[in-house]
Interface confidence: medium
């Protein structure tokens, strides 16, 4: 059995920032889970991770240089991305894995959200010299 994920088809980020909400057909309350956001049609870049454990504080991090924060709802995770570059306009996919309690669950691949960055032309960091290619 797979978790279903709903995302907006497109979000426009005028000021290099955007809130992307991932809505799940599953209640995350009192669950240990790992929600992540991935860039590109091939999901090659893991943009941001939200790790939730019923006994600990929410952990939000990016290992790929994105400035991100996360907010947890009962059946959603919202990723707040800041300092996006125009050349990071791409399609972004929500992913969810529930580790506890058993059984392990993950999601059907979602339709993705095109994030259209229309803000200031910031200079990308060395981590992101250009867009990902499928």
């Amino acid at each position: 059995n797979k978790i279903l994920v709903k995302q907006s088809p497109m979000l426009v980020a005028y000021d290099n920032a955007v809130n992307l909400s991932c809505k799940y057909s599953y209640n995350l309350f009192s669950r240990e889970f790992r929600a992540s956001l991935h860039k590109g049609l091939d999901s090659a870049v893991e943009v941001c991770v939200v790790y939730g454990n019923y006994s600990q504080q929410l952990q939000v991090y990016s290992k790929t240089g994105f400035n991100c924060d996360g907010k947890l709802g009962n059946e959603s995770v919202t990723f707040y991305l800041q300092n996006l570059y125009v050349n990071q306009t791409d399609i972004y996919f929500c992913k969810i894995e529930v580790m506890y309690p058993p059984p392990y669950l993950d999601n059907e691949k979602s339709n993705g959200t095109i994030i259209h960055v229309k803000g200031k032309h910031l200079c990308p960091s060395p981590l992101f010299p250009g867009p990902s290619k499928p």
Partner: antibody, heavy 125, light 107 residues
Framework: EVQLVESGGGLVQPGGSLRLSCAAS????????MSWFRQAPGKGLEWVSV???????YYADSVKGRFTISRHNSKNTLYLQMNSLRSEDTAVYYC???????????????????WGQGTTVTVSS | EIVLTQSPATLSLSPGERATLSCRAS??????LAWYQQKPGQAPRLLIY???NRATGIPARFSGSGSGTDFTLTISSLEPEDFAVYYC?????????FGQGTKVEIK
Amino acid sequence: EVQLVESGGGLVQPGGSLRLSCAASGFTVSSNFMSWFRQAPGKGLEWVSVIYSGGSTYYADSVKGRFTISRHNSKNTLYLQMNSLRSEDTAVYYCARHGITGTTGDYYYYGMDVWGQGTTVTVSS
Amino acid sequence: EIVLTQSPATLSLSPGERATLSCRASQSVRSYLAWYQQKPGQAPRLLIYDASNRATGIPARFSGSGSGTDFTLTISSLEPEDFAVYYCQQRSNWPPTFGQGTKVEIK
């Protein structure tokens, strides 16, 4: 006036190459999402490729590895480089602009709002 | 990929009559469906986006409805210039896909 004008079509042998051009006026190609579509004789429309404003490019499975979409910012022109052409690539090719606007956090996508007149590609020996 | 099936393939009507065109998706596309008009030798023209919103400059006789898997384009009173082929297109799932078209011809 906002418009797109395609060129570069013609007759080519199977296995050959062509480069289609799509010159834009009245708006900036590089700040828009631009796609190529095609329409085989007597058939419906098929999406071929897209280039996002950020430069990311994607392709239909039927052309992946053979076609390359690109743009020249100062010439305000979109291109489609077509290699290893097959008879099933015979079609009228259109470039089109994705109509997108909105405010922070909102998406407003309203379909392909500007189309070129089309250029005919015939692949035959 | 999502398959869009349009019906009927051909619609034979007279000017002034009402035209009802159908587009059915193989799975839900929510409201992310557009309609285009194409005349012979011309590029497509956007009529309706997001199922029910008229594009700029499109006359009020064109209207769209539906959500999920079933959509309808209605032309309330056909004008001579409305005889053309109409395509639906979804943007809910990758890749974007079109229906095979409905030809509206003069009876």
